[in-house]
């Protein structure tokens, strides 16, 4: 499917890996090594998370692999190419005027990326315009060493941002989850994601989403009315990828938002979320940073009850146990709380309607010098049937105008011991957070809902 894109999009072939600067303004490109593509898949999925410093859980609590460790391992695996989509980059403390030892892991990651470029491994970065961390020099540093960087003008194209957070390494390995390329995501913000190793089918499918960003990052790019066939996906909610992950029968697919960036065959992210909610019969546990049944960044605000209605319908009509864990930190918009209280008000145990909402407060402690940190940034949902790991907060903009990706995975309990399925692991992580002292019922919060840890 190596068909050239229309010339207005620049000289990029969707399955090509951007490698190094050419002589003109276009990029010199090389296809992935055929040998790499031919290797047999032996997919493995590992849940990864960041637990902020000074956030101790009860002794013996389950935990996933540390995100920083997983990222460094992934980069050690790279032989050909690393493609990164991230809302913004801020891997060093000085980016935000902070001198804090907890930025060291981010700085080590930036060093590792520079070393990769020194070994002639290509690095392609798609990032957002508009973006945060505008003082960050990470991307200039990397570009100076040969990285190819495109700022995708989502503000102009869809009135949103590029909010996706994923990596595709060598067309075989994947990271996706809630973490941006930010040192705080490694040590000061609670994050959750997944790393998938040795899974070229899924990796090359996610690469198609990366390529939608890549072609929109050229000057004067326009959104196509119809995406060319070579961007189409054959892996979706109707035809998920099926394979053995560590010997466990697994189905998986990636969803994407907004719909304007979903070529044929790509399941829209909202549809994926609703499908997972709709198939639940026992429970829906969701952990999201923000929950707004409205638009979020546009004026005037519009009411948007799509996800809210789905949760209410599951609880009311099917007796599904709904638990929603929402983040609460210094930068939480207090207008969210009436919506949370409204959702919880549906709960009626006598009528078998169970809806519980808690807020998760990361104690600031002695980290008050670090802005936009000490927050649960995760975006995931788990039911008895499936795990959903996403990059989007739950409000309309994230599904209608802002880019994001979701991963939906279902594993069969079958032969392996109980607790081994991804959805079971994710459920245990959710329950660890839900039952921790950092998760506070709405009624346990001060009237001002100021999200300050009361201990």
């Amino acid at each position: 499917w190596q068909v050239r894109c229309p010339p207005t999009w620049g000289q990029v072939q969707p399955r090509d890996v951007p490698r190094s600067w050419g002589h003109g303004s276009s990029l010199a490109l090389e296809p992935l090594e055929a040998e790499v593509r031919k290797q047999r898949d032996s997919c493995q999925l590992v849940l990864v998370e960041s637990i902020p410093q000074d956030l101790p859980f009860a002794a013996g609590s389950l935990s996933a692999q540390p995100l920083g460790q997983a990222w460094l391992q992934l980069l050690d695996t790279a032989q050909e190419s690393v493609h990164v989509a991230s809302y913004y980059w801020s891997l060093t403390g000085p980016d935000i005027g902070v001198n804090d030892s907890s930025s060291q892991l981010g700085e080590a990651l930036l060093q590792k990326l520079q070393q990769l470029l020194g070994r002639n491994i290509s690095l392609a970065v798609a990032t957002s315009s508009p973006t945060l961390a505008r003082k960050s020099t990470d991307l200039q540093v990397l570009a100076a060493r040969g990285a190819q960087v495109r700022r995708v003008p989502m503000g102009r194209l869809t009135r949103g941002v590029l909010h996706s957070k994923f990596w595709v390494v060598d067309g075989r390995h994947i990271y996706m989850g809630s973490a941006n390329m930010d040192w705080r995501s490694l040590t000061q913000v609670k994050e959750l994601g997944a790393v998938i190793y040795n899974c070229s089918h899924l990796a090359q499918d996610l690469e198609k989403t990366f390529q939608t960003y890549w072609v929109l990052g050229v000057p004067k790019a326009v959104l196509p009315k119809t995406w060319p066939q070579n961007f189409s996906s054959h892996i979706n909610r109707f035809q998920p990828f099926q394979g053995l992950f560590d010997g466990v029968p697994t189905t998986a697919y990636f969803s994407a938002s907004p719909p304007a960036l979903c070529p044929q065959g790509r399941t829209p992210d909202l549809e994926a979320l609703l499908a997972v909610m709709g198939s639940a019969q026992e429970f829906i546990y969701a952990s999201v940073m923000e929950y707004f049944p409205t638009t979020r960044f546009s004026h005037p605000r519009r009411y948007w009850p799509v996800l809210d209605n789905a949760l209410r319908a599951a609880a009311f009509s099917k007796g599904v146990r709904v638990r929603l864990l929402v983040s609460c930190g210094l930068n939480t918009d207090p207008t969210m709380f009436p919506y949370l209280r409204s959702l919880q008000a549906l709960s009626n145990p006598a009528a078998n309607v169970s809806v519980d909402v808690k807020v998760f407060i990361v104690p600031v402690g002695n980290h008050s010098n670090i802005p936009f940190s000490r927050v649960n940034h995760s975006k995931f949902m788990v039911t008895e049937k499936a795990a959903y790991i996403g990059t989007s907060n739950w409000s309309e903009d994230y599904f209608s105008s802002t880019t994001g990706v979701g991963l939906v995975v279902t594993q069969s309990p079958g032969a392996q011991p109980a607790g081994a399925t991804v959805q079971e692991q994710l459920r245990q992580l959710f329950e660890r957070d839900w039952s921790s002292r950092y998760a506070v019922g709405l009624d346990g919060q001060a009237p001002g809902q100021d999200c300050v840890w009361q201990g």
Epitope: Y87, S128, S129, P130, T131, L132, R134, K135, R151, G155, R156, V161, H163, M289, E290, F297, G329, L330, N331, T332, D333, P334, S368, N369, P371, F372, V375, H377, N393, G448, D450
Partner: antibody, heavy 124, light 107 residues
Framework: DVQLQESGPGLVKPSQSLSLTCSVT???????YYWSWIRQFPGNRLEWM?????????NYNPSLKNRISITRDTSKNQFFLKLNSVTTEDTATYNC?????????????????WGAGTTVTVSS | DIQMTQTTSSLSASLGGSVTISCRAS??????LNWYQQKPDGTVKLLIY???RLHSGVPSRFSGSGSGTDYSLTISNLEQEDIATYFC?????????FGGGTKLEIK
């Protein structure tokens, strides 16, 4: 409705310090946002002077860095401007303003609420 | 610091007509531009943020456009209440900087 109101002496002598207060009603200055001072010189030119953020941290315009201090009193919901060693060049209308919103992940910044301004003349 | 220049310090237009006010940055500010209206009594209001987004409660007669270093504010169907001075402001970097203002008068 959020309202900001500046107050302070209208006349300051050269080489002295200029001190102004911004009183905020309808919103807690320790909840969110950056709380800024902006001045407008005769002839209309606007200059952002600096801010104090919801968490008490500061950022100042480098052109004023060694003369300016912005502090706050959260119990009174007020923030303050102190400008040392003033000259006649500091004659201006001084406005306080709120910049934000400071919600996580929001890439847009703007001064959405302004005070009416208070005129300060530096003269002997 | 990024310099913001509004070359036209004043202009006049007819009621019901339209007018465009321009603003230039000394370097690419990547659409991180806001527009404000200052009424003759000194009251300042945010009109448009991020080049083209209308702030809450601002009439749709106001619109913004631009990219790179060149930006503009257009007011169509001019009304008496639009008599004011209009300022652009960049928020790409600190320190925040403003244009010199364009005073709009009615013919």
């Amino acid at each position: 409705d959020v309202q900001l109101q500046e107050s302070g002496p209208g006349l300051v002598k050269p080489s002295q310090s200029l001190s102004l207060t911004c009183s905020v009603t309808g919103y807690s200055i320790s909840s969110h946002y950056y709380w800024s001072w902006i001045r407008q010189f005769p002839g209309n030119r606007l200059e952002w002077m600096g801010y104090i953020s919801y968490d008490g941290s500061n950022n100042y315009n480098p052109s004023l860095k060694n003369r300016i201090s912005i502090t706050r009193d959260t119990s009174k919901n007020q923030f303050f401007l102190k400008l040392n060693s003033v000259t006649t060049e500091d004659t201006a209308t001084y406005n306080c303003a709120r910049e934000g919103p400071l919600y996580y992940g929001n890439p847009y910044w703007y001064f959405d609420v302004w005070g009416a301004g208070t005129t300060v003349t530096v003269s002997s | 610091d990024i310099q913001m220049t509004q070359t036209t310090s004043s202009l006049s237009a007819s009621l019901g007509g339209s007018v465009t006010i321009s603003c230039r940055a000394s370097q690419d500010i990547d659409n991180y531009l806001n527009w404000y209206q200052q009424k003759p009594d000194g009251t300042v209001k945010l009109l448009i943020y991020y080049t083209s987004r209308l702030h809450s409660g601002v009439p749709s007669r106001f619109s913004g456009s631009g990219s790179g270093t060149d930006y503009s504010l257009t007011i169509s169907n001019l009304e008496q209440e639009d008599i004011a001075t209009y300022f652009c402001q960049q928020f790409n970097t600190l320190p925040r900087t403003f244009g010199g203002g364009t005073k709009l008068e009615i013919k």
